[in-house]
């Protein structure tokens, strides 16, 4: 796992530069874990990152994402998906220019390297859920979420909104 | 236009009920969470209930000062919210405002303009 | 539960001044690194407008001169040249857990 001392090389409290045309409202570095508090960890394979789902020991430490958050502005006439309003949406960076990516077409979330300004496969849509949970929507697929699937991170549609609490999109966010 | 339009307030005898209605237009509805709250003549704003998405069934939660006697309740099929009020005393006496939250469940974005209680006898 | 303790109770100022209202929590309002913290603007007989979410983002169509500010316990709108449409009620919330508690209001009046 590298996440720890990757992150610890960002310095700043605030991203300097834009990030498509804006900045982060804020930043906050995490642990991030499954509702079933399994840790979300990243290790260097074959010269490419890995993304796993697992139990770590009693005292191994956790691997830690720097979230930063945007604002966004989101006309229900333009996006056509009758979601209007003021939204959060972050990116997710486990190690320095590295950000979690949602690949639509394999449905899957990977780690790529990446130039800023960030592409918006990059952005998700933040939800607060309730149990203290977030869960996070892929900006480029409307719902389609960050989930769970094989002990891997996967892309999982969520059908309707009912369906929006299963615990399998669902992730816990921890200073420790 | 996003829209909150509430109705079915009234004046009731203490002990009564009613049933408020809140029927939403502009955006799909049942992408988001719904609130009530409410305002006494002259008062600040109270929160009363919220009525949120969930896997199996809608979770709701209360104001310690309603629970038990009020009931919040939706309708996807008729993008509409409601709350129904029993045992109705005059400290409810209030204008009921009907709230979206934003898309994601941050923070309360849309009020509708609020339909008023009046509980005496 | 979550008590918010807004001050002053209300103001007399004029067109132009510089306008501050604070808000205390009584416990941190933080989660996820974001201050669940938000401030409404309330004329009489109309509903409450959103002003400020997440203690420092403006809400839509909102005009630059709300602002705010804080994080955990102390927040803080400013109006930083009340125009004469900003003669109000203003009432802080946070929205971190049920029940999500009010300010009791603070009246902006004119001098």
């Known amino acids: 796992a590298f996440g720890i001392s990757g992150v610890q090389k960002y310095t700043r409290a605030l991203h300097d530069s834009s990030i498509t045309g804006i900045s982060p409202i804020t930043e906050y570095l995490a642990s991030l874990s499954t509702y079933n508090d399994q840790s979300i960890t990243f290790a260097l394979e074959d010269e490419s990152y890995e993304i796993y789902v697992e139990d770590l020991k009693k005292d191994e430490k956790k691997d830690k994402v720097l979230l930063s958050y945007y604002e966004s502005q989101h006309p229900s006439n333009e996006s056509g998906d009758g979601v209007d309003g003021k939204m959060l949406m972050v990116t997710l960076s486990p190690t320095k220019d590295f950000w979690l990516h949602a690949n639509n077409k394999e449905h899957s979330v990977e780690l790529h390297k990446c130039e800023k300004p960030l592409p918006d496969q990059a952005f998700f849509v933040l939800h607060n859920m309730h149990s203290n949970c977030v869960s996070f929507e892929c900006k480029t697929d409307p719902g389609v979420f960050i989930g769970v699937k094989d002990n891997h991170l996967a892309l999982i549609k969520v059908d309707s909104s009912e369906n929006l609490c299963t615990e399998n999109i669902l992730f816990k966010l921890s200073e420790t | 236009e996003v829209q909150l339009v509430e109705s079915g307030g009234g004046l009731v005898q203490p002990g009564g009920s009613l049933r408020l209605s809140c029927a939403a237009s502009g955006f799909t509805f049942n992408k988001f969470w719904m609130n009530w709250v409410r305002q006494a003549p002259g008062k600040g704003l109270e929160w009363v209930a919220e009525?949120?998405?969930?896997?199996?069934?809608?979770?709701?939660d209360y104001a310690e000062s309603v629970k038990g006697r009020f009931t919040i309740s939706r309708d996807n099929a008729k993008n509409s919210v409601y709350l129904q009020m029993n045992s109705l005393r005059a400290e409810d006496t209030a204008v009921y405002y009907c709230i979206r939250r934003n898309y994601g469940n941050w923070f309360f974005e849309i009020w509708g303009q609020g339909t008023l209680v009046t509980v005496s006898s | 539960d979550i008590q918010m303790t807004q001050s002053p109770s209300s103001l007399s100022a004029s067109v132009g001044d510089r306008v501050t209202i604070t808000c205390r929590a009584s416990?941190?309002?933080?989660?996820?690194?974001?201050?669940?913290m938000n401030w409404f603007q309330q004329k009489p007989g109309k509903a409450p407008k959103l002003l400020i979410y997440a203690a420092s983002n403006q809400g839509s169509g909102v005009p630059s001169r709300f602002s705010g500010s804080g994080s955990g316990t102390d927040f803080t709108l400013t109006i930083s040249s009340l125009q004469p449409e900003d003669f109000a009620t203003y009432y802080c919330?946070?929205?971190?857990?049920?029940?999500?508690?009010f300010g009791q209001g603070t009246k902006v009046e004119i001098k």
């Open positions: 416990e941190s309002v933080d989660r996820y690194g974001i201050s669940f």
């Open positions: 919330q946070h929205s971190k857990e049920v029940p999500y508690t």
């Open positions: 009525i949120r998405l969930n896997s199996i069934n809608y979770v709701k």
